[in-house]
């Protein structure tokens, strides 16, 4: 289940520049890139039981993947 977006203003760094909905924040290069360039999670098959991660890396309230991936179990990355 998706959780509400969190503040992404981390303890160790200022929040990254918000990414537009089709972009994701790449921690290694510290800027927004097309989500398709990152190995974003695929939706799990029905019955998969891993708990949802507590946050994700996109500094944006919408999920940071393309239109076809809006059902990802992660909130958008940082």
């Amino acid at each position: 289940m998706r959780r509400g977006p969190r503040s992404l203003r981390g303890r160790d760094a200022p929040a990254p520049t918000p990414c537009v909905p089709a972009e994701c924040f790449d921690l290694l290069v510290r800027h927004c890139v097309a989500c398709g360039l990152l190995r974003t999670p695929r939706p799990k098959p029905a019955g998969a039981s891993s708990p949802a991660p507590r946050t994700a890396l996109q500094p944006q309230e919408s999920v940071g993947a393309g239109a076809g991936e809006a059902a990802l179990p992660l909130p958008g990355l940082l």
């Epitope: 992404l8 303890r11 760094a13 990254p16 290694l28 398709g36 990152l38 946050t55």
Partner: antibody, heavy 118, light 111 residues
Framework: EVQLQESGPGLVKPSETLSLTCSVS????????WNWIRQPPGKGLEYIGY???????YYNPSLKSRVTISRDTSKNQYSLRLSSVTAADTALYYC????????????WGQGTRVTVSS | DIVMTQSPSSLSASVGDRVTITCRAS??????????MNWFQQKPGKAPKLLIY???NLGSGVPSRFSGSGSGTDFTLTISSLQPEDFATYYC?????????FGQGTKVEIK
């Protein structure tokens, strides 16, 4: 599912160059980060470096002067070259790829053992 | 580089025991509200397997007896009831910044 498979010579002579290739199936190396990690016999894991979706590279400073990571997108493979090897480079070499957004390496090759000896 | 220090370096335990392994980072591995701390299990001659990512999230196919906790610099991997297949070496690893670094490993042996 993403699968990675290392290949290359199991024996390299001192002072020569070690060359390994990682063949990737189930995903494109033009997406994500593609890494090399090694493990000397009986020891822990050491990060070597990555090549990214864009072709940019990062090398661990401890090895930087001797390492080159490159890719062949037409074959969906990436490669490691380590020059001027010594016995200390004897190790099990792994290729691996991390997930996003947590950058945790969830896909690994089975590893290939490289021995440096004359 | 961020230095990862695990303890203990080895431990002996019995099937059914609760096992706790700790990892301390030389600086915080938190960023943007995420703890970039991962745990791996490795058996002899095999590649490491991701057990826990982002400090507390279970990897794919990992049994629920494994759990992770912590934030900042101090983290814990717990096996609630040790099973025969859990005897292995466990590594912590930070993915906050490159070079990604690993702890020295904790070998869990049969008592």
């Amino acid at each position: 599912e993403v699968q990675l498979q290392e290949s290359g010579p199991g024996l390299v002579k001192p002072s020569e160059t070690l060359s390994l290739t990682c063949s990737v199936s189930g995903d494109s190396i033009t997406s994500g980060y593609w890494n090399w990690i090694r493990q000397p016999p009986g020891k822990g894991l050491e990060y070597i470096g990555y090549i990214s979706y864009s072709g940019s590279t990062y090398y661990n400073p401890s090895l930087k002067s001797r390492v080159t990571i490159s890719r062949d997108t037409s074959k969906n493979q990436y490669s490691l070259r380590l020059s001027s090897v010594t016995a200390a480079d004897t190790a099990l070499y792994y290729c691996a790829s991390p997930n996003y957004p947590f950058y945790a390496m969830d896909y690994w090759g089975q590893g290939t053992r490289v021995t440096v000896s004359s | 580089d961020i230095v990862m220090t695990q303890s203990p370096s080895s431990l002996s335990a019995s099937v059914g025991d609760r096992v706790t392994i700790t990892c301390r980072a030389s600086e915080s591995v938190d960023n943007y509200g995420i703890s970039f701390m991962n745990w791996f299990q490795q058996k002899p001659g095999k590649a490491p397997k991701l057990l826990i990512y982002a400090a507390s999230n279970l990897g794919s196919g990992v049994p629920s007896r494994f759990s992770g906790s912590g934030s900042g610099t101090d983290f814990t991997l717990t096996i609630s009831s040790l099973q025969p297949e859990d005897f292995a070496t466990y590594y912590c690893q930070q993915s906050k910044e490159v070079p990604w670094t690993f702890g020295q490993g904790t070998k869990v042996e049969i008592k």
